[in-house]
């Protein structure tokens, strides 16, 4: 969490950003909030990016002002206009790409004063893994697949019964580059599994951590998966 203040004493307002991650090929949100003002027409929001000459986005007098917008952000940005009055200056970014990563500044002017806060925005790819029993294999084998990751993650297997066990000797992980030549498909195979046990396939890079669980019994197979972003630090 980054909390920024205005420069000049009583004319400062609090601006808060949250470091976040964008999944390439989807819309992303850069979070920023500020002390609200009564009049929308008195609020100016400017988003800037370190190393970029033009503005990322500007909102003033109740509407977008995009004449100074940098070419790399044209057609891609939006604020939530109906939420500005309550202090939400968050930015929506369409079709996030790797090159969108960097340091952004959320700069606010209201009738109460000015304030700004920086935000670290990471970009990469992350997806939910799916764990299945591989019936084609000669022995009891589990197959964990996740379609899109970047940067290359680590894959670790764990089991409920053999807690703390190292499965690296009985597993094999491969990374296959996807057609857009950036993200990769992750496939990890775990051999010699036993029934009546819950196995977890954990995929992690510096942006996200995802886990796929599978419980195999004689009568049924239960699956569960979840994904968590790692770098949501507020400023």
């Amino acid at each position: 969490l980054i909390i920024g203040f205005g420069i000049s004493g009583r004319h400062s307002i609090t601006v808060t950003t949250v470091a976040s991650a964008g999944n390439i090929g989807e819309d992303g949100i850069l979070s920023c909030t500020f002390e609200p003002d009564i009049k929308l027409s008195d609020i100016v929001i400017q988003w800037l990016k370190e190393g970029v000459l033009g503005l990322v986005h500007e909102f003033k007098e109740g509407k977008d002002e995009l004449s100074e917008q940098d070419e790399m952000f044209r057609g891609r940005t939006a604020v939530f206009a109906d939420q500005v009055i309550v202090g939400n200056a968050s930015l929506r970014l369409k079709n996030v790409q790797l090159t969108d990563a960097g340091t952004y500044k959320c700069y606010i002017i209201t009738s109460k004063g000015k304030g700004n806060a920086n935000l670290e925005y990471k970009t990469g790819a992350f997806s939910m893994p799916e764990v299945n029993v591989d019936y084609n294999a000669s022995s009891e084998t589990l197959r964990c697949e996740a379609p899109r990751w970047f940067p290359q993650p680590t894959v670790v297997w764990a089991s409920q019964v053999d807690q703390g066990a190292n499965f690296s000797e009985v597993s094999n992980t491969s990374f296959e580059l996807n057609s857009e030549n950036v993200t990769m498909k992750v496939v990890s195979v775990l051999y010699n599994v036993t029934i009546n046990n819950t196995y977890s396939c954990m995929i992690e890079n510096d942006i996200a951590k995802a886990t796929g669980d599978i419980k195999v019994t004689e009568s049924e197979i239960k699956r569960r998966s979840h994904l968590q972003l790692l770098n949501s630090k507020a400023s």
Partner: antibody
Amino acid sequence: EVQLVESGGGLIQPGGSLRLSCAASGFIVSRNYMNWVRQAPGKGLEWVSVIYGSGRTYYADSVKGRFTISRDNSKNTLYLQMNSLRAEDTAVYYCARDGDYGMDVWGQGTTVTVSS
Amino acid sequence: EIVLTQSPGTLSLSPGERATLSCRASQSVSSSYLAWYQQKPGQAPRLLIYGASSRATGIPDRFSGSGSGTDFTLTISRLEPEDFAVYYCQQYGSSPLYTFGQGTKLEIK
């Protein structure tokens, strides 16, 4: 040259199924937001579905649960699987790339007629 | 649900005249996500304007877009014979994710 070519349209009975294809050249489908947009005879444009670069999909309420958008990255091709077709699905179906600058590349369209 | 309403439904003008087409949204639309298209009979739509005011590649400078919030305008400064067509505005980002206006038919007077 950047282009999209649709195929797979035709005459189909109500309740039937059809799969439309859209072959892309000159750019990579999986890096873009790819859409299906339709136009009923004498009517305006209606958005049908989108697949994001990430693979996430969205649909118009009118087709939700009946239509499925997908892509084959190795073939650089977009698809629209249409099930439980109704007379009101009769239209010219266009695939369109939504680049950073709006829907900047469109196919020529393929006609779907749902009639008994 | 966001609705884009275009007016007029039909606009009858002569070549050389100025055309002003309106697109009104039922709720605020980001300028970045507002586009205009031209469609001629038997053809696919063609992108004219994106980001409310930026001309797409190869579009003549007689076409211009303006507006913000809920009111957007497409202006054709001097009509050429090839400009007579149907024009659509379109938004991205609200529910539904993409929405088109019903269109304005620009016809020769």
